[in-house]
Interface confidence: low
């Protein structure tokens, strides 16, 4: 049953004399393994014998007989799948049909393969894309329907006979589907490649030429142009004439339109290959080119830079930077349209020529206020001198200058006055917007240039102001020199160092902390009575009568200041003691009599002692001696003694008379 044999292999194989052929082949015999294989050349079926006749190139049988031809032909297959064959070398007369006679135990099959062997190596075939455009990458393919393991070959690309630089990718196929060798070349053709010959050359392993295929490149491209100008350097003066000519060196396909452009903008009504410019003006300076279009697109020539020369135009000045800060650096740039460029410049400051400044730029490394003003310049080239433009203003900014603090009041200033100060300055840029004052007082301090100090203090010594724009400038402090009455007047005891005892020598000092003006007078007062006009008050021998409240006054031309009252205390032993009797010095017996020891002492008496007419001390120590009931025997003279920390004093005798009561007299 022939349907059981399935073969796969290329239908036709190609080779040339002396090369080799490799026939990839697979089969399937479902009923069993291959028993016998014969390779026929141009087999013919003989009906009489029911066998195939023809040249046997290879035979594999059970008995193992191998014809001599088998050295050239090799069966590389197996008994159930592979039927690959190799013929090496292959000859011209091997062309025709190869018949593979396959036999298994029960089945037979004849499979035919075409072999085309040429006398010489046949050429490869170059495949091109349908259209090639300049600068667009294309792939060129060179295909050869040949590949054989025993005969290595190579495909080389040539452009106008010269090997191409681009790397080609070669691939081979030896499969049951196809047998070929292919070379692919990626290539970005330029317009100059148009019409050039590309060759794919087949070479053997040693690089020997075998065959080739050639094609002519048809590279579509925009028109390629050349521009010519008279005069050739394209430098003219106003009023001259200029001619430009456009030549097409290549175009594929043919060009259709022509136009001219200046600085990228199309010139109207200029559609010929010649551009005539008559009596040119400086505005016609610029970059000219011609543009020619075809179906691919527009092509442009190189640009011609037409320079129409003219004298400098009125100049302008650019300042880097204004406003400028005093002490900073500033650069001035003179800008003037001219062709050729100016070679010399003249600079002016406030209309006056700046000597030695001939460059396009003027650099001032350290700006001062007097540099402010208008800067202008004049440019000059070979065709003439330009006009001076309007100029530019340099604004120089600086802190307020010569700041002074000025006292507006008539002098002298007295404590308690309202003082007005102003902050003055000579110049400032930008203008002063605020003021600062030092020290920071409790007064209301405006941000303005006038400071009012209400009720000025005696201790306000110096004031300074600052005028501020972007910076603050401080004035030197001014002294207010406030005049005031003497301050902190007080009485101070100089001697004795300890407490004052009666009889001591005593000195009191009138002190004050400060006075402006310094010339002062002193006054001492006790109980409203003037005692002296010196700074000290002296007592040679103090007596208790000198004790009391003392004040001193210090005055100057502004006013006088009193001290606080100072109490002078004199310590003395008890004195002027006397015994007083109540209700009197004559008392009736049985009544009550009180004796009081009166004294003058500082400090007060701390201890009393009572004595009778016999100088006998009585057991009583208080200031009062109470006799109740009083008896006639109590009659007599009494005296008392007082004691303090300074000493003792005694009273004179005082007599108490106690008389009998009527009752007593009645009883007698």
């Amino acid at each position: 049953d022939s349907s059981k044999w399935v073969f796969e292999h290329p239908e036709t194989l190609y080779a040339w004399e002396g090369a080799c052929v490799w026939i990839p082949c697979t089969y399937r015999a479902l009923d069993g393994d291959l028993e016998s294989f014969i390779l026929f050349h141009n087999p013919e079926y003989n009906k009489n014998t029911s066998k195939f006749d023809g040249t046997r190139l290879y035979e594999s049988t059970k008995d193992g007989k191998v014809p001599s031809e088998q050295k050239r032909v090799q069966f590389l297959g197996d008994k159930n799948k592979n039927c690959t064959l190799s013929i090496h070398p292959v000859h011209l007369n091997d062309s025709g049909q190869l018949g593979l006679r396959m036999e298994s135990k029960t089945e037979k099959w004849m499979e035919r393969i075409h072999l085309n062997v040429s006398e010489r190596p046949f050429p490869p075939h170059i495949q091109l894309p349908p259209e090639i455009q300049e600068s667009q990458e294309v792939t060129l393919t060179c295909l050869l329907n040949f590949s054989c393991y025993g005969y290595p070959i190579q495909l080389q690309w040539l452009l106008e006979g010269v090997p191409m630089r681009q790397a080609a990718v070669t691939s081979t196929s030896l499969t049951i589907k196809s047998v070929f060798t292919r070379s692919e070349l990626k290539f970005s053709p330029q317009w100059s490649h148009h019409g050039k010959i590309v060759t794919c050359q087949l070479q053997d392993a040693d690089g020997k030429f075998l065959s080739n295929d050639t094609v002519q490149l048809n590279v579509k491209h925009t028109p390629k142009l050349e521009i010519k100008v008279t005069p050739s350097d394209a430098i003219v003066r106003e009023g001259d004439s200029v001619t430009m000519t456009c030549e097409v060196s290549s175009s594929n396909p043919e060009y259709t339109t022509v136009s001219w452009l200046k600085d990228g903008t199309s010139l109207k009504k200029q559609n010929t290959f010649t551009l005539n410019l008559r009596e040119v003006t400086k505005d016609q300076s610029g970059k000219y080119c011609c543009q020619v279009s075809n179906d691919v697109g527009p092509g442009r020539s190189e640009e011609v830079f037409l320079q129409v020369q003219y004298a400098p135009e009125p100049s302008t000045v650019q300042i880097l930077h204004s406003p400028a800060v005093e002490g900073s650096q500033v650069e001035f740039l003179c800008m003037s349209l001219a062709n050729p460029l100016p070679t010399n410049y003249t600079w002016y400051h406030n209309g006056k020529e700046m000597q030695g400044r001939t460059e396009e730029k003027v650099h001032i490394p350290k700006i001062l206020p007097w540099h402010a003003g208008t800067y202008s310049c004049v440019a000059e080239n070979i065709l003439g001198t330009g006009q001076r433009g309007p100029g530019a203003e340099l604004d120089v900014q600086y802190p307020p200058k010569k700041v002074t603090t000025v006292i507006q009041n008539p002098m002298p200033i007295r404590e308690g006055d309202t003082v007005t100060l102003s902050c003055n300055y000579n110049s400032s840029n930008p203008s002063v917007t605020r003021y600062e004052w030092k020290p920071h007082g409790a007064w209301e301090e405006p941000s303005l240039g006038v400071l009012k100090i209400q009720n000025v203090g005696w201790d306000n010594t110096t004031i300074a102001c600052a005028a501020c724009n972007s910076w603050c400038s401080w004035a030197s402090p001014v002294a207010l020199n406030v005049q005031y009455a003497p301050r902190d007047v007080r009485v101070r005891k100089i001697k004795p160092l300890s407490e004052i005892h009666s009889g001591n020598s005593v000195s009191l000092q009138c002190d004050f902390s400060s006075s402006h003006p310094k010339e002062v007078q002193f006054f001492w007062e006790k109980n409203g009575r003037l005692l002296g006009k010196e700074s000290q008050l002296n007592f040679d021998s103090i007596s208790p009568e000198d004790a009391g409240s003392y004040s001193c006054w210090v005055n100057n031309s502004i006013g006088q200041t009193a001290s606080k009252a100072w109490t002078l205390e004199v310590l003395y032993a008890p004195r002027r003691l006397r015994v007083s009797m109540s209700p009197g010095d004559q008392v009736m017996e049985g009544k009550s009599a009180t004796l009081t020891c009166e004294s003058d002492a500082n400090p007060p008496v701390s201890h009393y002692t009572w004595f009778d007419w016999n100088n006998q001390s009585l057991p009583y120590h208080s200031q009062k001696l109470r006799l109740e009931p009083v008896k006639v025997q109590h009659s007599g003279a009494y005296w008392c003694q007082g004691t303090n920390s300074v000493g003792k004093g005694r009273s004179p005798l005082s007599t108490l008379t106690v008389y009998y009561s009527p009752e007593t007299i009645g009883r007698r």
């Epitope: 917007t433 301090e445 405006p446």
Partner: antibody, heavy 121, light 113 residues
Framework: EIQLQQSGPELVKPGTSVKVSCKAS????????MYWVKQSHGKSLEWIGY????????RYNQKFKGKATLTVDKSSSTAYMHLNSLTSEDSAVYYC??????????????WGQGTSVTVSS | DIVMSQSPSSLAVSVGEKVTMSCKSS????????????LAWYQQKPGQSPKKLIY???TRESGVPDRLTGSGSGTDFTLTISSVTAEDLAVYYC?????????FGGGTKLEIK
């Protein structure tokens, strides 16, 4: 970018003191005066005073003399406000504000995020 | 010290409405030397630091929308918002920097209905 980063919230006892800091970045610390502003809860703003970091000069609102002391540490670009003898009246948010007078005499200003001080026993 | 008084203390408006708030100073803030009014307006949104909107009484800080306009001279000043948006919810303070100590107004609280 100019920033003023103030110290975190403070809870302190009456009679004690507190020091609020304000760290400046993104500019020359000595060019801007550092102002301090008080905002009591739900109330308006009160100007405490300022310090000039360049020379340490200070100016106080009379109301805050003796209460607030302003100082700076130039090396760390930080301004400080020390509040003493604290009472509940001092509970507030305190802001630092950097002010620079430009060419026009107009004050550019940048504010800190504020520091909350709460005085409670 | 210069006393700054603002009115009203609060107001509630709908989005799109026009609003004006007033600020009065106890003495003139106009400096004759440069004819500038030393007055600024600040906006303080909830939980944020104050932000300066206007200085010299009428000059807008960069980035401040032209819906906000400052006007006035001497002692009477006004801040106007021509068409209120939800973004404008804040307290607005005026401040004088004519004389030390600088002082602020009590503020006007703007609420959105």
């Amino acid at each position: 970018e100019i920033q003023l980063q103030q110290s975190g919230p403070e809870l302190v006892k009456p009679g004690t003191s507190v020091k609020v800091s304000c760290k400046a970045s993104g500019y020359d610390f000595t060019r801007y005066n550092m102002y301090w502003v008080k905002q009591s809860h739900g109330k308006s703003l009160e100007w405490i005073g300022y310090i000039d970091p360049y020379n340490g000069d200070t100016r106080y609102n009379q109301k805050f003399k003796g209460k607030a002391t302003l100082t700076v540490d130039k090396s760390s670009s930080t301004a400080y406000m020390h509040l003493n003898s604290l009472t509940s009246e001092d509970s507030a948010v305190y802001y630092c504000e950097a002010i620079y007078y430009d060419m026009e005499g107009y004050a550019l200003d940048y504010w800190g995020q504020g520091t909350s001080v709460t005085v409670s026993s | 010290d210069i006393v700054m008084s603002q009115s009203p203390s609060s107001l509630a408006v709908s989005v799109g409405e026009k609003v004006t708030m007033s600020c009065k100073s106890s003495q003139s803030l106009l400096y004759s030397n440069n004819q500038k009014n030393y007055l600024a307006w600040y906006q303080q949104k909830p939980g944020q630091s104050p932000k300066k909107l206007i200085y010299w009484a009428s000059t807008r800080e960069s980035g401040v929308p032209d819906r906000l306009t400052g006007s006035g001279s001497g002692t009477d000043f006004t801040l106007t918002i021509s068409s209120v948006t939800a973004e404008d919810l804040a307290v607005y303070y005026c401040q004088q920097f004519y004389s030390y100590p600088w002082t602020f107004g009590g503020g006007t609280k703007l609420e959105i209905k």
